[in-house]
């Protein structure tokens, strides 16, 4: 597809906002050379892609933000993969670098003469995209421009650093955050001993470095850690669970910093390989409460406990998109496609390279059938709101009792519009307050979500706490029947009294034998046994010595009774 | 640590019988344990195995005429409706692993006949 | 579903020869295979575990290889007491599953 025409989708505007989404799904092992992407998306695509067009709608027709000012789009889709959406933010950027004395609309030749071609108005920022490694290149091309990019669930720990990504903005909090969540469940169940997955690729492994360093300071061993990436081949799902049942019995417990299609390659792994309940994930929110993770793997996800950003669903959102027809919405250019995948008909006049399906689509069809919305839509809108918001500041302070476009913003300053987007707070799509601290990050509010059996073959998440300001809350009668339902995820069970821990040669610290301290010895501490002194007794309870009462003989008392050798 | 299979006996078709396989110096909260058959100059035939977990996995010929279950010291096999094609030395085996790798302890077997 | 077939079903080799048994897995199980001896009137014993580690007490005649569907066991230098039938059996999957173990290579010894 690299030498495929890409599709973009457009909105006209007097301020055009890029936005890079995955409408596809990212190419396979075998098609990354030629960055051919995967199966058209529709929570993390189309959805988001509707939801940008629906709310620069809302936005331009809202009196009171940008007046007399039109939004416009370039929506181009990232594929979940660097290479894609590098090549996608080079379009975005080329035909729209004009000088600040060039005329707007205008390209000069290079001989002097002017042209009638119109240029592309330039971006002034983008939103997105999706994943953090595809963002971090992303933000390496755009910062050259000064161009801003807020992210709606980019949430890495290292686009916090202002130093290396100074034009990077989000409306979702650092990974730091959902580590220290995570932590502090496996902490909550004294699971002590965990393995531990991450997905290969800046999100997972910043993530389960703070997750692996936040362990340890709270004395959670790892009994091993692997990585992997989403679009591994089966072999090597395969093979990872293999190496995850090496640590059974003692490490149950998965901690999975991972995408959603990762967790996917490990359910249908655990279905192959017959070790369905074999293990609880405790998964990050690249999982959150993602139907598109456990369609048809339900008895393999059955007891996972996931983190999820706190994100209300977005009513109107709805209202809008499940109206939506193929027949009637041209300005999507993926529509179409998604249609015919969502519902595996085909639509009569449309080109289909393979008529890879069979029956024409019936008109009755609707979104509503099966609709669930993209987990993340309060953050795309939020994104798209922050940077009108940002426009508006940067609008009233340059152009003051002026509506519309003054010459001030033209063409607009993208270090003005940083520092004014930096700045920026309003009353977001859920009520809650969106701010950006000095690194450009939002405050973390997390829900802790719970998979499970609601009925034969009728599975669901449900919330069963919340992480917010360093604060757990846990239900736990929700999550375990009964108590004694509490998996266990540990190395070595407490020593009896009177016993120390071995740690073997080479083990973690979470796994010892326990080895019981000799006839004089207590003990001093977990891992030491000491000798009682001449003349004292290790006490009953092993922690200490008393001294030996002496007892005097005395003139009148029995003579000691004593064995010689000779007594056979 | 050793493994050893019982109730092997002459049963008639249709009938229930459960093998019962008692092991020593082995916690079977740690590993997994298959039950293995085979028929008089035939080859091993993998029946099933329960994990260290409880979970039990059958071969696909199985369905539903044997059931593995555990207690802490002894590993079960139900056979339910038993024909004369079930007639085979019965033998437990130890996983090396809390799920399924490689038997590296073996019981010594228990005869069932089916014969009317 | 999952199977696994032996070749030759049975063979004669002369003490002190070599004897070469090979497996088949009808889909990649990595280098999850394993090779029991057995003889009349015992239970098998484990001989390779993972394709190719010798189990404790297994001696060094006993060679296998391979890895994703396909498997080879050696015997060299054969002796008396390795007349015996040899399983192999695969260790990667118990889901849709017709039998872990091969059909088994009876081997005399000449």
């Known amino acids: 597809q690299s030498s495929e025409r890409r599709v973009v989708a457009h909105m006209p505007g007097d301020i055009i906002i890029g936005a890079l989404f995955s409408v596809h799904h990212q190419p396979t092992v075998d098609k990354v050379h030629e960055r051919k992407c995967g199966a058209v998306r529709e929570q993390y695509g189309i959805q988001r892609v509707e939801a940008m067009l629906h709310t620069l709608e809302r936005i331009n027709s809202d009196p009171t933000l940008l007046p007399n000012i039109t939004l416009g789009c370039e929506i181009r889709d990232s594929c979940w993969h660097s290479a894609v959406a590098l090549e996608q933010s080079i379009e975005f950027i080329r035909d729209s670098l004009i000088s600040s004395e060039e005329e707007e609309g205008l390209v000069r030749c290079v001989d002097g003469s002017s042209s009638s071609f119109r240029s592309k108005k330039p971006i002034v920022g983008v939103i997105g995209p999706g994943s953090s490694s595809v963002a971090i290149q992303v933000q390496n091309l755009l910062q050259l421009f000064n161009i801003p990019q807020i992210a709606y669930s980019a949430t890495s720990m290292d686009l916090s650093d202002k130093t290396l990504f100074k034009y990077f903005m989000r409306v979702v909090p650092s990974d730091a955050q959902q580590a220290r969540a995570m932590v502090d469940i496996v902490k909550r169940y004294n699971w002590t001993y965990v393995s531990a997955v991450h997905t290969e690729g800046n999100y997972g492994e910043s993530g389960m470095e703070a997750f692996k360093d936040m362990s340890a300071k709270e004395g959670i061993c790892i009994a091993h850690s692997y990585k992997i990436y989403s679009n591994a081949g089966e072999q090597s799902f395969d093979k990872l669970l293999k190496k995850l049942t090496s640590h059974l019995p003692k490490a149950r417990v998965v901690a999975c910093f991972c995408e959603g299609m990762t967790v996917r390659g490990l359910l249908m792994a655990m279905r192959r390989l017959g070790l369905a309940g074999e293990f609880l994930l405790l998964g990050s929110d690249g999982w959150a409460d993602r139907y598109d993770v456990t369609d048809g793997y339900q008895r393999e996800a059955v007891g996972g406990i996931t983190i999820k950003l706190q994100s209300p669903d977005v009513k109107w959102f709805d209202d809008y998109y499940l109206k939506l027809r193929p027949e009637t919405n041209h300005r999507n250019p993926w529509f179409q496609e998604f249609w015919q995948h969502r519902f595996q008909c085909r639509l009569e006049g449309f080109p289909q390279e393979n008529s890879k399906y069979n029956k024409t689509c019936d008109s009755s069809l609707t979104l509503k059938t099966h609709h669930v919305q993209d987990s993340k839509m309060g953050f795309v809108i939020n994104a798209i709101y922050s940077m009108a918001y940002g426009l508006h500041n940067m609008q009233m302070s340059l152009c003051p009792g002026y509506a519309g476009l003054c010459d001030a913003m033209k063409p607009i300053d993208g270090r003005k519009l940083l520092e004014s987007l930096m700045k920026t707070n309003f009353t977001g799509v859920s009520g809650d307050m969106i701010l950006f601290d000095e690194n450009g990050d939002s405050p973390g509010r997390y829900e802790i979500m719970n998979f499970k059996e609601m009925g034969k073959d009728y599975f669901d998440y449900i919330n069963v706490g919340s992480w917010d300001n360093g604060e757990l809350k846990m239900d736990d009668d929700e999550v375990w029947s009964k108590k004694s339902n509490i998996i266990r995820s540990v190395c070595s069970e407490p020593c009896e009294k009177g016993q120390i821990k071995v740690i073997r040669k080479g083990e973690v610290s979470c796994c010892w034998t326990c080895t019981p301290c000799k006839e004089n010895e207590y003990v001093f501490d977990e891992y030491t046994c000491k000798a009682c002194q001449l003349g004292s007794w290790p006490t009953d309870d092993l922690t200490g010595c008393d001294l030996i009462p002496v007892q005097y003989l005395r003139w009148g008392d029995p003579e000691p009774d004593y064995k010689d050798d000779d007594d056979k | 640590q050793s493994l050893e299979e019982s109730g092997g006996r002459l049963v008639t078709p249709g009938g229930t019988l459960t093998l019962t396989c008692t092991v020593s110096g082995i916690d079977l909260s740690s590993y997994a344990m298959s039950w293995v058959r085979q028929a008089p100059g035939k080859g091993l035939e993998w029946i099933g195995i329960?994990?260290?977990?409880?979970n039990t996995w059958y071969a696909n010929w199985v369905k539903g005429r044997f059931t593995i279950s555990k207690t802490s010291t002894t590993v079960d096999l139900k056979m339910t409706s038993p024909t004369t094609e079930d007639t085979a030395t019965y033998f437990c085996?130890?996983?090396?692993?809390?799920?399924?790798?490689?038997?590296?302890?073996w019981g010594q077997g228990t005869l069932v006949t089916v014969s009317s | 579903a999952f199977h696994m077939t032996q070749t030759p079903a049975s063979m004669e080799v002369a003490v002190g020869g070599t004897v070469t048994m090979k497996c088949q897995a009808s889909?990649?199980?990595?280098?999850?295979l394993n090779w029991y001896q057995q003889k009349p009137g015992q239970p098998p014993k484990l001989l390779i575990y993972q394709a190719s580690k010798l189990a404790s007490g297994v001696p060094s005649r006993f060679k296998g290889s391979g890895s994703g569907t396909e498997f080879t066991l050696t015997i060299s230098g054969v002796e008396c007491a390795d007349a015996a039938t040899y399983y192999c059996q695969q260790g990667w999957s118990t889901n849709d599953v017709d039998n872990v173990f091969g059909g088994g290579t009876e081997v005399v010894v000449k």
């Open positions: 085996a130890r996983d090396s692993s809390a799920t399924f790798n490689y038997l590296d302890l």
């Open positions: 889909e990649s199980i990595d280098t999850y």
């Open positions: 329960i994990y260290a977990s409880g």
